[in-house]
């Protein structure tokens, strides 16, 4: 899937644009808003009726190297008594993000943008039945 | 930066860390191309902490369209379909990386940008602080 070029007629390619070889693009990986942090309510992964655990995946050939994935603890949801209620289902909520992948081909190195699907947390839903045989 | 394992037979001049600027292939590698959460699942409607999805569009960014979740209620939906204010619907936020055109309007020059998105909502037990 290619990154769309600026197709809007009111956009003109500025003279200041850097020259880039065909089929590639220039990417500055010094992150804008690097220090921005999530300001979520405290411990929501434990307080949720569909609680989850976190796992850190590490890959030195990926930028950023650390990606955190959530896994729902239960199939059902936690009821008011603190028990798992299987009449409801815990389901993962997912979001795509971009990473830069570094590939070694012999002694040369190339870089590739990659979409990664991250499980962010879980929510409790009413189960559905799609098909009764 | 990130330390990268080097092929032992390669010259030592190779930088161990990711360089500040890289040339990358225009093709994005991955099969996860469905970026519209409304099409991928209906969890936003079936959740006990349902949310609405708002389209955020910016042609200077890739992806240009990002969907933002906003919880519909302060409380959660109970078994009777009513809002129960003994529980709270809260957004689940995530930092994601996007591409920002830099300099602006340039077709093939980008910088990584970290943005904070609300992806969905979850139902939690509220924290009650007792004031002495």
């Amino acid at each position: 899937r290619k990154i769309p070029k600026v197709g809007h007629t009111f956009f003109q390619k500025p003279e200041s644009c850097p020259p880039v070889p065909g089929g590639s693009m220039k990417l500055d990986i010094g992150i804008i808003n690097e220090n921005q942090r999530v300001s979520m309510s405290r411990n929501i992964e434990s307080r949720s009726t569909s609680p989850w655990n976190y796992t850190v995946t590490w890959d030195p050939n990926r930028y950023p190297s650390e990606v955190v994935q959530a896994q729902c603890r239960n199939l059902g949801c936690i009821n008011a008594q603190g028990k798992e209620d299987i009449s409801m289902n815990s389901v993962p909520i997912q979001q795509e993000t971009l990473v830069v992948r570094r590939k070694h081909q012999g002694c040369s190195v190339s870089f590739q943008l990659e979409k990664v699907l991250v499980t962010v947390g879980c929510t409790c839903v009413t189960p559905v039945i799609h098909h009764v045989q | 930066g990130i330390t990268i394992p080097r092929n032992p037979g390669c010259p030592n001049s190779e930088d161990k860390n990711f360089p500040r600027t890289v040339m990358v292939n225009l093709n994005i590698h991955n099969r996860n191309t469905n970026t519209n959460p409304k099409r991928s699942s209906d969890y936003y409607n079936r959740s006990t902490s349902p949310w609405n999805l708002h389209r955020n569009e910016d042609p200077e960014r890739y992806p240009s369209v990002i969907w933002e979740a906003k919880c519909r209620h302060l409380g959660c939906i109970n078994a009777d379909g009513n809002v129960d204010y003994h529980m709270n619907s809260v957004p689940i936020q995530q930092e994601i990386l996007v591409l920002r055109r830099e300099p602006p309007h340039c077709p093939n020059s980008f910088r990584l940008e970290k943005i904070l998105v609300s992806v969905g909502c979850t139902c939690v037990t509220p924290i009650v602080h007792h004031v002495a």
Epitope: S90, V91, V125, T126, V128, I129, H131, Q133 | Y43, R46
Partner: nanobody
């Protein structure tokens, strides 16, 4: 398309036991989760036991906890529901089901009748 086939139902006295089996005809349980639900005449459908394949997480309805056990035989590609200390209120048609993704139960069997007499 996976076809789920249940067996093992029947008539049993209160306090007795039964073991229900569920096989995937024409395929495997290549799903996120598998489970059993039951439906008695005039009553709502009730999930009784569920099993997640990735980590073997099991969970039960309060009404059957301690009496029913869900298990699987990977080699035979079969899911079981061991039911003991059966009560008349356990009388229902029992169905095997699979969810190919969380929260979405796609396939159901034809069901097997369990009748518990007092």
């Amino acid at each position: 398309e996976v076809q789920l086939v249940e067996s093992g139902g029947g008539l049993v006295q209160a306090g007795g036991s039964l073991r229900l089996s569920c096989g995937a005809a024409g395929g495997t349980f290549s799903s996120y989760a598998t489970g059993w639900f039951r439906q008695a005449p005039g009553k709502e459908r009730e999930f009784v036991a569920v099993f997640r394949w990735s980590d073997s997480h099991t969970a039960y309805a309060d009404s059957v906890k301690g009496r029913f056990t869900i298990s699987r035989d990977g080699a035979k590609n079969t899911l079981y529901l061991q039911m003991s200390s059966l009560k008349p209120e356990d009388t229902a048609i029992y169905y095997c089901t699979t969810a190919t993704r969380p929260g979405e139960w796609d396939y159901w069997g034809q069901g097997t009748q369990v009748t518990v007499s007092s």
